[in-house]
Interface confidence: medium
């Protein structure tokens, strides 16, 4: 399986909400001994390997934010903890999964990584990630809504609040 990132860059005004999105592609093993985790974390730029370093998102670790199930199933974080931090992660039946961040501040700017981990027998770990950048802007140059830049081309799209 692979992970696709529809958008590589999100440019948002301060105070706005944004939903960062990834998509799980390809066949997934539905064996009884296989579990899938989908999660999010922050990383830093300028590494040899993108997403190799991990940091919490608004003080929440990847384990606080994960969705855990047996494949292309729908799920949501119902964690009060995440929602108290203005975060919610979700996934649908089509392999899409996302994290919504509410009331963005300049401190939310940075590199975000989505991750899919396949675990067999509760032990061995196979993982695939995608990366995207969030830029939160303030002042007169900030867009009125989030602007997203597709990964495959330079065309941008305006999106309204999540």
């Amino acid at each position: 399986f692979k992970v696709a990132t529809p958008y590589s860059l999100y440019v948002c005004p301060e105070g706005q909400n944004v939903t960062l999105t990834c998509r799980l592609l390809g066949p997934v093993d539905k064996g009884h001994d296989v579990t899938f985790y989908k999660t999010w974390y922050r990383s830093s730029r300028g590494e040899v390997q993108t997403c190799s370093e991990r940091r919490p998102i608004r003080n929440l670790t990847f384990q606080d934010l994960h969705l855990h199930h047996g494949g292309h199933q729908a799920a949501n974080t119902s964690h009060d903890l995440a929602q108290r931090h203005g975060l919610e992660s979700a996934s649908d039946h089509h392999g899409n999964f996302s994290i919504t961040m509410r009331n963005l501040t300049l401190l939310d700017s940075g590199l975000y990584c989505c991750l899919v981990v396949e675990i067999r027998h509760h032990h061995s770990e196979h993982r695939v990630h995608g990366a995207m950048e969030l830029q939160v802007q303030t002042g007169k140059d900030a867009p009125s809504n989030c602007v997203v830049y597709p990964s495959s081309s330079q065309e941008s799209e305006n999106i309204t609040a999540a």
Partner: antibody, heavy 121, light 112 residues
Framework: QVQLVQSGAEVKKPGASVKVSCKAS????????INWVRQAPGQGLEWIAR????????YYNEKFKDRATLTVDKSTSTAYMELSSLRSEDTAVYYC??????????????WGQGTTVTVSS | NIMMTQSPATLSVSPGERATLSCKSS????????????LAWYQQKPGQSPRLLIY???TRESGVPDRFSGSGSGTEFTLTISSLQSEDFAVYYC????????FGGGTKVEIK
Amino acid sequence: QVQLVQSGAEVKKPGASVKVSCKASGYSFTDYYINWVRQAPGQGLEWIARIFPGSGNAYYNEKFKDRATLTVDKSTSTAYMELSSLRSEDTAVYYCARDDSFYGYWYFDVWGQGTTVTVSS
Amino acid sequence: NIMMTQSPATLSVSPGERATLSCKSSQSVLYSSNQKNYLAWYQQKPGQSPRLLIYWASTRESGVPDRFSGSGSGTEFTLTISSLQSEDFAVYYCHQYLSSYTFGGGTKVEIK
């Protein structure tokens, strides 16, 4: 840079307990597992247990699950391993080591300098 | 638990020569989903902590000299040091991380 710094050597009597610390720096402490591995004199490496500091959830080698207790202090980025009911065969160097896994198991990319624990009457 | 067996226990080699260390696992550490071998090698010098050399059976850790190479798949693995330098005389451990964690007993590489 990423570093794990352990507490100093300990000498304990049989039946006592020892608590070894491991202070992390240079990375997000809450997001990486900390493992404890020991090495008896002239012997190989033996995995004891691991803990995920973000949640405090710990996982133990069956051999040590009744005697080892792992804890963390997130405010000081420090992990602890306490080993109780010490016996002479627990004399060893105890290492903390970071692993890079998310939910499964992974290799150990950073090691502490080791803490020598001697159990002697 | 997966058992790891290293041989020989001691290897006597002259500086500049090649050293070949063996590690065998009691069951395969190859993961079918990604065709990766969950095996690492560490170097330990006297009085020091282990240092990661190789992971995924053949990927060198950053900063490790290219005279170190790992090979093998499934249950049989080899660490090769192509031309031994004085700083390479140490104990080497293999480590499987497919199912919990186990280490081999180590191979001591000493000066001949």
